[in-house]
């Protein structure tokens, strides 16, 4: 026990002695922040000159203060112990560590491109003045339904599947019902529409079969040929104009 105490005391004395010797050997270590060790003046601690600072003690030089000019504006003035801090003038926002760059703001619903601010394409949104347009949330990936449609300024809002809903109320983080992921409501709606059409055609065919038996087969063939001839005509008509998103017509959307 006594031996260990002796070791501790001995170590402490060694450390204290080393610190004393170090300060005798290097008087600069005594210079506090806001000063520098002036070699020209017998290593006296001199205060940092105007527009310079030293944030740590024992420095042989002071650093030049950062100047916030142009698109940068001063957020915190330079002091003898700390550098100036900049942010960006209105209409711009900071980028990089310590606000090393300023980038132009855009409006909500836009993103910054090489050609300036452009509206978000249909199906994407940006709710901030910086960053890129991001695709709307796909609610079906979580087995949820669309509660509120998205716009270029804001995302879609997902809610519980209709089966889970008591009228009016909805859970912000509802339990996801078991549904195969990746089947969006649009795809499901498409298949439902397709099935309904097929059933209608079947019903139509059966009705015709019973009512047109006596009239012969030529007329029946003509009725069935007609619908399949129409789309050819439609595509020819559509060739005259290109299909574009509304945002594109405003000159905003680059694909």
């Amino acid at each position: 026990m006594g031996n260990s105490c002796y070791n501790i005391v001995a170590t402490l004395l060694l450390v204290l002695n080393f610190e004393r010797t170090r300060s005798l050997q290097d008087p600069c270590s005594n210079c506090p922040a806001g000063t520098f060790c002036d070699n020209n003046r017998n290593q006296i601690c001199s205060p940092c000159p105007p527009n310079s600072f030293s944030s740590a003690g024992g420095q042989r030089t002071c650093d030049i203060c950062r100047q916030c000019k142009g698109v940068f504006r001063t957020r915190k003035e330079c002091s003898s112990t700390s550098n100036a801090e900049c942010d960006c003038t209105p209409g711009f926002h900071c980028l990089g560590a310590g606000c090393s760059m300023c980038e132009q703001d855009c409006k909500q619903g836009q993103e910054l491109t090489k050609k300036g601010c452009k509206d978000c394409c249909f199906g994407t949104f940006n709710d901030q003045k910086r960053g890129i347009c991001r695709p709307w949330t796909n609610c079906s990936l979580d087995g949820k339904s669309v509660l509120v449609n998205g716009t270029k300024e804001r995302d879609v809002v997902c809610g519980p599947s209709p089966a889970d809903l008591s009228p009016g109320a909805s859970s912000v983080t509802p339990p996801a019902p078991a549904r195969e992921p990746g089947h969006s409501p649009q795809i499901i709606s498409f298949f439902l529409a397709l099935t309904s059409t097929a059933l209608l055609f079947l019903l139509f065919f059966l009705t015709l079969r019973f009512s047109v038996v006596k009239r012969g087969r030529k007329k029946l063939l003509y009725i069935f040929k007609q619908p399949f001839m129409r789309p050819v005509q439609t595509t020819q008509e559509e060739d005259g104009c290109s299909c574009r998103f509304p945002e594109e017509e405003e000159g905003g959307c680059e694909l």
């Epitope: 949104f125 910086r130 949330t137 990936l141 995302d155």
Partner: antibody, heavy 127, light 110 residues
């Protein structure tokens, strides 16, 4: 059940520092935006800062910019608020709040509001 | 001074309907979703309405939210004594790059 437990509040002198923590349980912490909201005695709610889980993006109220730093440790299910250069006007009850809308599926949580709150920790700034 | 304007107080008698307004601008309410919070005395806030008009599960259908342009409203019908609390509207403000709360409305049930 969502549980948020704040700690680290206390008495500090003007110009001093304090680090608040918020231990989260009952939900997948790494999937949600988290905010700090404060309330000065007898006053209204004031949003302080938010941190996103996916890109680590942070935003601050103008009143605390450059002085406060929000951070999170998803492995520890903990949210932090480092408060430096504290002023008398920073004295308040600080609440930790969970946003609705799980990420990355949900792209923006702003629609869903803050659907989980802690009971708050009191910060007093006085000399 | 809050970016979102709410009346400091509102009152009503049990069973009646009361409406609390929240006014903002195009950079907040106009283009973003509004949420409403209820704070009972001495407790933490609780989410009441999200995405302008939707209620989380567990919130009675007596509470309803609506939005028009740059203003939002919270309506409470069939007023009860337990509804006596502070009510706050909130939204994202893209120009401030942050969330903003209204200054709060103290509801008194007479």
């Amino acid at each position: 059940e969502v549980q948020l437990l704040e700690s680290g509040g206390g008495l500090v002198q003007p110009g001093g520092s304090l680090r608040l923590s918020c231990a989260a349980s009952g939900f997948t912490f790494s999937g949600y935006d988290m905010s700090w909201v404060r309330q000065a005695p007898g006053k209204g709610l004031e949003w302080v800062s938010v941190i996103y889980p996916d890109d680590g993006n942070t935003y601050y109220a103008d009143s605390v910019k450059g002085r406060f730093t929000i951070s999170r440790d998803n492995s520890k299910n903990t949210l932090y608020l480092q408060m430096n250069s504290l002023r008398a006007e920073d004295a308040a009850v600080y609440y930790c709040a969970k946003h609705g809308g799980q990420k990355p599926t949900t792209k923006s949580s702003s629609a869903y509001g803050m659907d989980g709150w802690g009971q708050g920790t009191l910060v007093t700034v006085s000399s | 001074q809050s970016v979102l304007t709410q009346p400091p107080s509102a009152s009503g008698t049990p069973g009646r309907r009361v409406t609390i307004s929240c006014s903002g601008s195009s950079s907040n309410i106009g283009n973003n979703y509004v949420t409403w919070y209820q704070q009972l005395p001495g407790t933490a806030p609780k989410l009441l309405i999200y995405a302008d008009s939707h209620r989380p599960s567990g919130v009675p259908d007596r509470f309803s939210g609506s939005k028009s342009g740059t203003s939002a409203s919270l309506a409470i019908s069939g007023l009860r004594s337990e509804d006596e609390a502070d009510y706050y509207c909130a939204t994202w403000d893209y120009s401030l790059s942050g969330y903003v709360f209204g200054c709060g409305t103290k509801l008194t049930v007479l």
